[in-house]
Interface confidence: medium
């Protein structure tokens, strides 16, 4: 016997209070698949989050981060502060890369310069806080 709720499309819920009729999702909620017995509350992009895609009756809102921050985690679950190139984010804020390390992005950690001698090469261009060394022949 077919479940009558399976006829309820995305954007609706199967209303047990009304003989399993398909009711529209209330505002600020959505159902992305058919046959759902409730709708899900829309994600709200507040504070450091900003709305990349509005919630609709069939899909959740999508957030990204305000300028000066970048997304972390699945679906941009967190916003992390940007640093400048040549820096890394620590508990005490953005700190310059130590000598011998670099970071060419606004996120992530400082990484050691390439050791050219390991490949039998010499340093062609010295490294900086923002750029790795360039190895030559």
């Amino acid at each position: 016997l077919q479940d009558p709720c399976s006829n309820c499309p995305a954007g609706t819920f199967c209303d047990n209070n009304r003989n399993q009729i398909c009711s529209p999702c209330p505002p600020n909620s959505f159902s992305s698949a058919g046959g759902q017995r409730t709708c899900d509350i829309c994600r709200q992009c507040k504070g450091v989050f900003r709305t990349r895609k509005e919630c609709s009756s069939t899909s959740n809102a999508e957030c990204d981060c305000t300028p000066g921050f970048h997304c972390l985690g699945a679906g941009c679950s967190m916003c992390e502060q940007d640093c400048k190139q040549g820096q890394e984010l620590t508990k005490k804020g953005c700190k310059d890369c130590c000598f011998g390390t670099f970071n060419d992005q606004k996120r992530g950690i400082c990484r050691p310069w390439t050791n050219c001698s390991l490949d039998g090469k010499s340093v062609l261009v010295n490294g900086t806080k923002e750029r790795d060394v360039v190895c030559g022949p």
Partner: nanobody
Framework: EVQLLESGGGLVQPGGSLRLSCAAS????????VGWVRQAPGKGLEWVSA????????YYADSVKGRFTISRDNSKNTLYLQMNSLRAEDTAVYYC???????????????WGQGTLVTVSS
Amino acid sequence: EVQLLESGGGLVQPGGSLRLSCAASGFMLSAEDVGWVRQAPGKGLEWVSAILDFGGSTYYADSVKGRFTISRDNSKNTLYLQMNSLRAEDTAVYYCARVVYHAGGGVTFDYWGQGTLVTVSS
């Protein structure tokens, strides 16, 4: 016992106005998220308007924005829907309903009224 009783429907010409009322008993409208849902002849249910966040925010379907206004009178425990510039496509049975938030994170309408018919025709 929770009850919702709609009134104010009727026959109106295109461009005309109506005000629907929904009298609640058994719970306080002022402490709930409530709204209006309609069902046109032969069609599915469509949400029309709602008051959420303890009256702080009003929401309207795109099809009625700028024409319909939702409000409530807490002293009378009554929800209203002022409908202006009515069109033939607004013909439907209008229900008021409560928005319910479930422990698992889901959202539904419940406590529907019996509905009031609005017919827009010349």
